[in-house]
């Protein structure tokens, strides 16, 4: 407890060039008699910023009316802030002395520093797609912020990630800083609709962090599963064979049918459907003419997905004697 306390609540004040800075100072007592002055710095070389009694301070205004009775607020505003204004500001109470005023009590000081907001985070994914169960790296970059202290977090679908490395440059003093962070993300088969978020929190953002996003759809390749089936019913002298290409992403897909190793040029009917998880299904039908078929027909459904090596599924056609009889009956 003290007779008089000088309260400067902010240890650090971040200001932007061209704006107005408010430096707060309140006193707990109006005694002893004497003025409150503002200085930048300490010691004999300190610079007088404001004196309520005398001097000309065109950029400085008081928050309260200092001539008002019982005023205990000696806060000031400094307009048109420039880089030259940075430093630590002290409000200092003087008491009337004989013959001149004597410094009585100083506030703890408020450091004024130039603050700059970070740029919107930019998130970049891998150059090439990767399949589930593998790890991909995402980078997040933000620039131009000051002071250096900054917090960066990664999220995948709202869940915070822990496997990442962050660097803030430069390490020494600078007017502005940059942050770069690399997160390692294990892909899941259902990640087509997933998002990674890079969140940057900085004192200049007043609790409203900046976010950058990337869609895992740009980074993931879900390879298809193939199934070739023969429909039990035949249409005239033709048997319907289905190739089902399931759960693939992206949509880019080439499908070809081969009959005993010979690529078939004729068109087939097909449908493309999208699944809830963002992957696709492709169904292709191939009609095989069985009127002149031998027993050893092998059909192959070959799929080339997203420029990858082709995968294929074979089906040895089962044509029963009964079917052949039906066929020869149907064909004169």
């Amino acid at each position: 407890e003290e007779e008089l306390q000088m309260i400067q609540p902010e240890k650090l004040l971040l200001v932007t060039v061209g704006k107005t800075a408010t430096l707060h100072c309140t006193v707990t007592s109006l005694l002893p008699v004497g003025p409150v002055l503002w200085f930048r710095g300490v010691g004999p070389g300190r610079e007088l910023i404001y004196n309520q009694k005398e001097g000309h301070f065109p950029r400085v205004t008081t928050v309260s009316d200092l001539t008002k009775r019982n005023n205990m607020d000696f806060s000031i505003r400094i307009s048109s802030i420039t880089p030259a204004d940075v430093g630590t500001y002290y409000c200092v109470k003087f008491r009337k002395g004989s013959p001149e005023n004597v410094e009585f009590k100083s506030g703890p000081g408020t450091e004024m520093a130039l603050g700059a907001k970070p740029s919107a985070p930019v998130v970049l994914g891998p150059a090439a797609r990767t399949t589930p169960e593998h790890t991909v790296s995402f980078t997040c970059e933000s620039h131009g912020f000051s002071p250096r202290d900054i917090t960066l977090k990664w999220f995948k679908n709202g869940n915070e990630l822990s496997d990442f490395q962050t660097n803030v440059d430069p390490t020494g003093q600078s007017v502005a800083y940059s942050i770069r962070s690399t997160a390692r993300v294990v892909l899941d088969p259902w990640d087509v609709r997933s998002q990674v978020i890079c969140e940057v929190a900085h004192v200049t953002l007043q609790g409203d962090p900046l976010r950058g996003t990337a869609n895992l759809s740009e980074a993931i390749r879900v390879p298809p599963t193939l199934e070739v089936t023969q429909q039990p019913m035949r249409v005239g002298n033709q048997v319907n064979v289905t190739c089902q290409v399931r759960k693939f992403y992206p949509q880019s897909l080439q499908l070809t049918w081969s009959e005993n190793g010979n690529v078939c040029q004729r068109e087939t009917a097909s449908t493309l459907t999208e699944n809830k998880d963002g992957t696709y299904n492709w169904t292709s039908w191939f009609l095989v003419n069985i009127s002149d078929q031998r027993d050893d027909v092998v059909l192959t459904c070959q799929v080339k997905h997203d420029g990858q090596l082709a995968v294929s599924k074979r089906l040895a056609l089962e044509v029963t004697v009964h079917q052949k009889d039906q066929s020869s009956d149907a064909t004169p």
């Epitope: 407890e1 007779e3 008699v33 004497g34 009775r69």
Partner: antibody
């Protein structure tokens, strides 16, 4: 609880010096100033001087030449020393806390007589 | 030195009535927007007790019957209504300029 207590000799011979101690409790002498005020019998109050928290002093100019105020922060004591006492220095001497004089001691009576 | 002149030197007031004490300074005691004038009550055999600081602010624990007003050179202490316990001598004091000075005192008697 804030308390101040003065202790002095009671009787001082003319031309001799006076030493009074004010012992305080409930506050720190580094944070508060202490005043000395006297009151002659049946008369009004007269401010003698103050010692501030930082140890600096201000005196009543009429008495400055024979007045000295000092303190010992660690012992929570303030000292008043007055030289060349005369009969008109007979008074009750009080110590009071700070510029606001919000707390007073009960005072110590000093009589200047041979 | 700033001379503080109190008037009247003594006054007698009936119980429940109002009492007004004046304090006039030989020069202004105002600085930095405030009046550095204070009021004390002293009863026989006791030290002074602070009542009002900075002309109009009531000290903690002091009844609201006491009030202070004024600025620059003219100040007033008002007690309304007066109670039997208010019988005492009242002093004004300035600490705007060294040496700090007290008024000569006003003795209040209750009828």
């Amino acid at each position: 609880e804030v308390q101040l207590e003065e202790s002095g000799p009671g009787l001082v011979a003319p031309s001799q010096s006076l030493s009074i101690t004010c012992t305080v409790s409930g506050f720190s002498l580094t944070g508060y100033g202490v005043n000395w005020v006297r009151q002659p019998p049946g008369k009004g109050l007269e401010w003698l001087g103050i010692i501030w928290g930082d140890g600096s002093t201000d005196y009543n100019s009429a008495l400055k030449s024979r007045l000295s105020i000092s303190k010992d922060n660690s012992k929570s004591q303030v000292f008043l020393k007055m030289n060349s006492l005369q009969s008109d220095d007979t008074a009750r001497y009080y110590c009071a806390r700070a510029g606001k004089m919000d707390y007073w001691g009960q005072g110590t009576s000093v009589t200047v007589s041979s | 030195d700033i001379v503080l002149t109190q008037s009247p030197a003594s006054l007698a007031v009936s119980l429940g009535q109002g009492a007004t004490i004046s304090c006039r300074a030989s020069e202004s005691v105002d600085s930095y927007g405030n009046s550095f004038m204070h009021w004390y009550q002293q009863k026989p055999g006791q030290p002074p007790k602070p009542l009002i600081y900075l002309a109009s602010n009531l000290e903690s624990g002091v009844p609201a019957r006491f009030s202070g007003s004024g600025s620059r050179t003219d100040f007033t202490l008002t007690i309304d209504p007066v109670e039997a316990d208010d019988a005492a001598t009242y002093y004004c004091q300035q600490n705007n300029e060294y040496p700090w000075t007290f008024g000569g005192g006003t003795k209040l008697e209750i009828k």
